[in-house]
Amino acid sequence: SAPGEDEECGRVRDFVAKLANNTHQHVFDDLRGSVSLSWVGDSTGVILVLTTFHVPLVIMTFGQSKLYRSEDYGKNFKDITDLINNTFIRTEFGMAIGPENSGKVVLTAEVSGGSRGGRIFRSSDFAKNFVQTDLPFHPLTQMMYSPQNSDYLLALSTENGLWVSKNFGGKWEEIHKAVCLAKWGSDNTIFFTTYANGSCKADLGALELWRTSDLGKSFKTIGVKIYSFGLGGRFLFASVMADKDTTRRIHVSTDQGDTWSMAQLPSVGQEQFYSILAANDDMVFMHVDEPGDTGFGTIFTSDDRGIVYSKSLDRHLYTTTGGETDFTNVTSLRGVYITSVLSEDNSIQTMITFDQGGRWTHLRKPENSECDATAKNKNECSLHIHASYSISQKLNVPMAPLSEPNAVGIVIAHGSVGDAISVMVPDVYISDDGGYSWTKMLEGPHYYTILDSGGIIVAIEHSSRPINVIKFSTDEGQCWQTYTFTRDPIYFTGLASEPGARSMNISIWGFTESFLTSQWVSYTIDFKDILERNCEEKDYTIWLAHSTDPEDYEDGCILGYKEQFLRLRKSSVCQNGRDYVVTKQPSICLCSLEDFLCDFGYYRPENDSKCVEQPELKGHDLEFCLYGREEHLTTNGYRKIPGDKCQGGVNPVREVKDLKKKCTSNFLSPEKQNSKSN
């Protein structure tokens, strides 16, 4: 029988009546066009909904938009279009919501052709009131908030000017012209690239990288011959053109661009690309594209300085620049990432790492599941996960994999069981241990979301027909109840729940279609009465993450420490609540060679934990570029993995001697940098 259809499944008592009393319908009094939804702040219950409708006329397009606001998690909405003077809002800019709980919102309006500049509507009280502001420029991008100060905004204009506001968009100042890309760094720093000879595209590879730490009063050129740049964790990356040819290399800085080191990564040609897949304050995952139109490349993981890289995964699926990759950070368990590889026969397979890229393996075949037609051996196969690539290929996959930091261990994804990803209709699988083991959760494709930190999982079948049924589980997807939320089925368009998975409200969005009209409609269901009581100590059990062999003294050790968590028992039907904080207890592990990566000039042979010297470097002095100087490295081949907390045990020694010579291969040496003030 399908999951949840066993008679033994514990049924939640009287749930139909409880949910019926907590189901709120809202019909939006406008024609169906597009709808976008944004949450304003955390735990505020404020949602903004923007509906837009385009009517193509003979010469131009007539547009109409409406703005709605809810302050009870979507149970009721109020039309507040009059607060923005019934102005048409440009959906391509979305709603720019301020960081944290600032309550700030910026909407960018459509203006008539001949106007001097654009127009924005600003709110700093969670969209209760808006102020109209006319801009001295036409915006090219959405307003970007400084992560440190939500009063500081930056935007690029259609004329490639970099504009900054220090008073939440009230007054704007152009601080630089000829800007291609701008990003906020830490401490209200702005990094941006500029062109000299005409355009961003024409100057690609000859751009300059600039920095301002005082919102445009003074500037420093921190890089030349720049192709592009990116920020990840505490690292600033720039891809820089080589002097002699059309190749480029990655340089990295950990001091906001004052000093640079060349990353020990392969250079790439014109048709190739680099991509930061994930980064934190400890390390970075970098994808380096393979030459030719292969659709794959190599993942490298960095050391703690972002300079020395270890090869992590070959044949990593990543279509052209800005294309699709399935690389997914499993946020519900430390160190876990899932992605896809393109095998020699062009089939796509899913790989998982539990130790931040140290080793990759196939996903374990779910218990009680059969291998599909892609499997050569019907008894041996793996689970393969559908992610961005499958969605881009228009497979019947409505959602990417889902995990939440506060729903420890839970991962939900569409997948198939075989030797490779299948084009057949997928099922939904769940892992409760961060990806080590999997179970089929639902038959066929579904939309799904996590509520109350994992206390409830909600799902809706993906169907081309109108729907009126929602499924929910209170035991991490083992058993399912179905609830008919409306008599009249709707064409379903999406599930919306507050980011962070702490809410107990879910909104089902869709439209109704009658003979002449079609209207947006939302149903918001509050599950608070299903989880009647607050969870107590007895509702939780202790769980050791990353446990694979209890007889191993270091069982559960990943990156030098193990973590025990208090997890909700599957049988407990209670509220974790909004204030739920994951309870965990770390224990430091003894160091082993697994806690070290191979240093510059060393590599690990397959299935070996020892680092050996690269044959081509044997007997040579190891000299490499660091902070624009040449360094001499005395090493026995090991460097501690970033973020690894192990103590004691094995301890390989390492020493770096400064040769005090300038690094000729470093295109971003400090000598080439200059400063200027406005």
Partner: antibody
Framework: QVQLVQSGAEVKKPGSSVKVSCKAS????????ISWVRQAPGQGLEWMGG????????NYAQKFQGRVTITADESTSTAYMELSSLRSEDTAVYYC?????????????????WGQGTTVTVSS | DIQMTQSPSTLSASVGDRVTITCRAS??????LAWYQQKPGKAPKLLIY???SLESGVPSRFSGSGSGTEFTLTISSLQPDDFATYYC????????FGGGTKVEIK
Amino acid sequence: QVQLVQSGAEVKKPGSSVKVSCKASGGTFRNYAISWVRQAPGQGLEWMGGIIPIGGWANYAQKFQGRVTITADESTSTAYMELSSLRSEDTAVYYCARQGRKTGYYYYYGMDVWGQGTTVTVSS
Amino acid sequence: DIQMTQSPSTLSASVGDRVTITCRASQSISSWLAWYQQKPGKAPKLLIYKASSLESGVPSRFSGSGSGTEFTLTISSLQPDDFATYYCQQADGHITFGGGTKVEIK
């Protein structure tokens, strides 16, 4: 082969406390929870609580909360159960048992190794 | 706490008989149930974990089934060594045991 060896029989007065030890040998003590289970004469089994030696995370049955303290010493691979405010109803055989473990969950797979039991008699 | 109700409390059977003991949980415990055998003056011995998984070294005549709230321990052909008291134990709440079933010679 894992073994759990418990301390010897005890005779106690009402109102006093008793501390029973349980020493593990031949296995990875730190990675398994140790439960304490008692059995009054002619009665069934009753779980009192348990501890995970690594980190010392203990939890107790509601009935014994406040009266029982379970501890573990990783260096000697020994778990302890102390029961205070003893009364005659506490007369029983007290067992320590290792919670079997196949995954990260410490308490879900039954108790696969048991101590020989310690008889505690409470009498005035 | 979750209550475990075991039945029957006593069972008379002969060698070679097929014996079935049931255990009911007061709420769903998924498959988190263990069965033990205890002989007088001895510590209990684990037979079955996770409702149906046989502990290593336990004869295959013992089997467990069920999930949710209803569970069964079956001895397919009773042997002389099997006369003992059997306990079920749930592990999905604070641990609780059933009251026990004494299997005696008919």
